[in-house]
């Protein structure tokens, strides 16, 4: 039985901008106006947003119909990008030994391309999704998840790895993006902001959500991540935006209630197995998809990103717990652990539903519809 966890009665952002007032281009914070201190190292080595391709090269993200009573990603209130990261406040941490890949952090040296040259690649993640520019792809069928409802035993490791909280998943969680596109889930982790500041990695028409969940999968064509890195479709990530809602999300509470135990960087605890699919939106049929990269070093490309149209609702208290409990490297709070959005450089974001067509005023404007690359598949 699925636990109710989505806000089902109002469109996304309906409370502030209103269904009739979708986020307009003129409402978007400009790159020049937004602080960039939160951007991770290496961003200065990458093309800036001023180098972004024109609108016709950009993709989009989209909502649900009113009949479904679900959340609409295109009807978003304007939210300022996060500013300066929190000041270091804690001394309860130790340096962890590790390989070069572990010696990176958000918002400081070393530059990410120095940690991994792939971080300076042309097809990186995350990206800004523009629903009006997404290419409707009828070939994109509902995602299939099998074995995601885990029994309480064996317990799973929940770990503060210094840049996120990560849940390691056992073998047997199978996911299919379509016929012959089969994967197994490896781990899930979260990205978040700070008090009053959103921290999702992907954005929708410039809007950043409070947080984002990533479930990382390895193609069954490969035995190991190392063998799949950089190979098209070798890795696939399911991503969903987390938003504030009126009720506690019982699925997420099973993880969030344990964060105090792993406050210190490098610490871990064991949690009973749970329904991993309950951490995701209930609608597996409406999503955006594009090819990008890992959002942290090694930043390998060829990663298939699937971003759900529907969001997941957590209570304000839960979102606060997520952003205010963990500590990272250098005696600092683990906050604002997201990478700046990266240029599309001609990539087209595909949608499994007609995201560029809706009843809002924007639909009446001339829209550049990108063609579906998978139409013949």
């Amino acid at each position: 039985q699925r636990l109710p966890r989505m806000q089902e009665d109002s469109p996304l952002g309906g409370g502030s901008s209103g269904e009739d007032d979708p986020l307009g281009e003129e409402d978007l914070p400009s790159e020049e106006d937004s602080p960039r201190e939160e951007d991770p190292p290496g961003e200065e080595d990458l093309p800036g947003e001023e180098d972004l391709p024109g609108e016709e090269d950009l993709p989009e993200v989209k909502p649900k119909s009113e009949e479904e009573g679900s959340l609409k990603l295109e009807d978003l209130p304007t939210v300022e990008a996060p500013g300066d990261p929190q000041e270091p406040q804690n001394n309860a941490h130790r340096d962890k030994e590790g390989d070069d890949q572990s010696h990176w952090r958000y918002g400081g040296d070393p530059p990410w391309p120095r940690v991994s040259p792939a971080c300076a690649g042309r097809f990186q993640s995350p990206v800004d999704i523009r629903p009006q520019l997404a290419a409707f792809c009828p070939a994109l069928r509902p995602l299939e998840l099998l074995g995601f409802q885990l029994p309480p035993l064996p317990e799973l490791r929940l770990r503060n790895n210094g840049h996120s909280v990560q849940l390691t998943l056992p073998p047997g969680l199978e996911m299919a993006l379509g016929p012959g596109r089969e994967y197994r889930a490896l781990q899930l982790h979260l990205h978040w902001g700070a008090a009053g500041r959103p921290g999702s990695e992907h954005t929708v028409e410039g809007h950043r959500f409070p947080a984002e969940i990533h479930v990382v999968h390895l193609s069954t064509a490969f035995a190991r991540v190392d063998e799949a890195l950089g190979r098209p479709g070798g890795l696939a990530v399911l991503a969903a935006f987390l938003e504030e809602g009126p009720e506690e999300n019982s699925a997420y509470e099973q993880l969030l209630s344990r964060l105090e135990e792993i406050a210190e960087e490098g610490s871990e605890t064991q949690v009973p197995g749970l329904d991993i699919s309950a951490l995701l939106p209930s609608d597996f049929s409406r999503y955006f998809q594009y090819e990008g990269s890992l959002t942290t070093p090694p930043c390998a490309q060829g990663v298939i990103w699937t971003v759900f149209n529907q969001t997941v609702m957590l209570s304000a208290k839960q979102l606060h717990t997520l952003s205010d409990t963990l500590w990272g490297p250098g005696d600092s709070r683990l906050q604002l652990n997201f990478r700046a959005t990266q240029p599309l450089n001609g990539r087209v974001i595909e949608a499994s539903f007609p995201a560029g067509v809706d009843s809002s005023p924007r639909a009446a404007e001339p829209v550049q519809l990108n063609s579906c690359l998978a139409a013949g598949d």
Epitope: E97, D99, L218, R224, D226
Partner: antibody, heavy 125, light 111 residues
Framework: QVQLVESGGGLVQPGGSLRLSCSAS????????MIWVRQAPGKGLEYIGF???????YYADSVKGRFTISRDNSKNTLYLQMNSLRAEDTAVYYC???????????????????WGQGTLVTVSS | DIQMTQSPSTLSASVGDRVTITCQAS??????LAWYQQKPGKAPKLLIY???TLASGVPSRFSGSGSGTEFTLTISSLQCDDFATYYC?????????????FGGGTKVEIK
């Protein structure tokens, strides 16, 4: 040439301690997860413990709390510190490298190759 | 905890025979199973990983199959050099308690 060489084995009394070393050459130890495995005389292979690229360690129940895995990246050497040794710890101890380079954040694993030649530890009074 | 049950424990065969060894996991490990060959006084040698992928330099007479909980190692035509002990290694995940386990071994001896 990729190679692992164990050392430090020998005779030790019950309750005693011993530290085994595994010197790596031909690759950078900190880019690979590493495992310790043992084999009692005439018996099968037994998993002891594991260290990830990030330095996190995991152990089999049979040695938890008594054995500690560590590594010195500057010396490209892996260690197994064994305390409170028992007669049943008598075995040949092998270190082995993860088959491919591993990334702490992804937690995947499938096989180990290469292996060291092994070092014999005898626990007896 | 994962347990790997290997059978038979001993197998008598002749050169040229087709030999099959099985390994059963106590819970599903997907395709995360490896096969090793060990000769007396030597370290184990990797033969097969990811259930069916032949390791570099291993003769094609060795093959592996299976997924989930049931796995098989097959030697299509036994050679003199193949008389040894074979172990399966199952990986449920290193971050799980006892999530790595070897089978008890199968000694292939001359009939």
């Amino acid at each position: 040439q990729v190679q692992l060489v164990e050392s430090g084995g020998g005779l030790v009394q019950p309750g005693g301690s011993l530290r085994l070393s595994c010197s790596a050459s031909g690759f950078s130890l900190n880019s690979y997860a590493m495992i310790w495995v043992r084999q009692a005389p005439g018996k099968g292979l037994e998993y002891i413990g594991f260290i990830t690229t990030g330095g996190t360690t995991y152990y089999a129940d049979s040695v938890k709390g008594r054995f500690t895995i560590s590594r010195d990246n500057s010396k490209n050497t892996l260690y197994l510190q064994m305390n409170s040794l028992r007669a049943e710890d008598t075995a040949v101890y092998y270190c082995a490298r993860d088959r491919v380079k591993s990334y702490d954040d992804y937690g995947d694993l499938d096989a180990f190759e290469p292996w060291g030649q092994g070092t014999l530890v005898t626990v007896s009074s | 905890d994962i347990q790997m049950t290997q059978s038979p424990s001993t197998l008598s065969a002749s050169v040229g025979d087709r030999v099959t060894i099985t390994c059963q996991a106590s819970q599903s490990i997907s395709s995360y199973l490896a096969w090793y060959q060990q000769k007396p006084g030597k370290a184990p040698k990797l033969l097969i990983y990811y259930a069916s992928t032949l390791a570099s330099g291993v003769p094609s007479r060795f093959s592996g199959s299976g997924s989930g909980t049931e796995f098989t190692l097959t030697i299509s035509s036994l050679q003199c050099d193949d008389f040894a002990t074979y172990y399966c290694l199952g990986v449920y995940g290193y971050s799980f308690d006892d999530g790595i386990a070897f089978g008890g071994g199968t000694k292939v001896e001359i009939k």
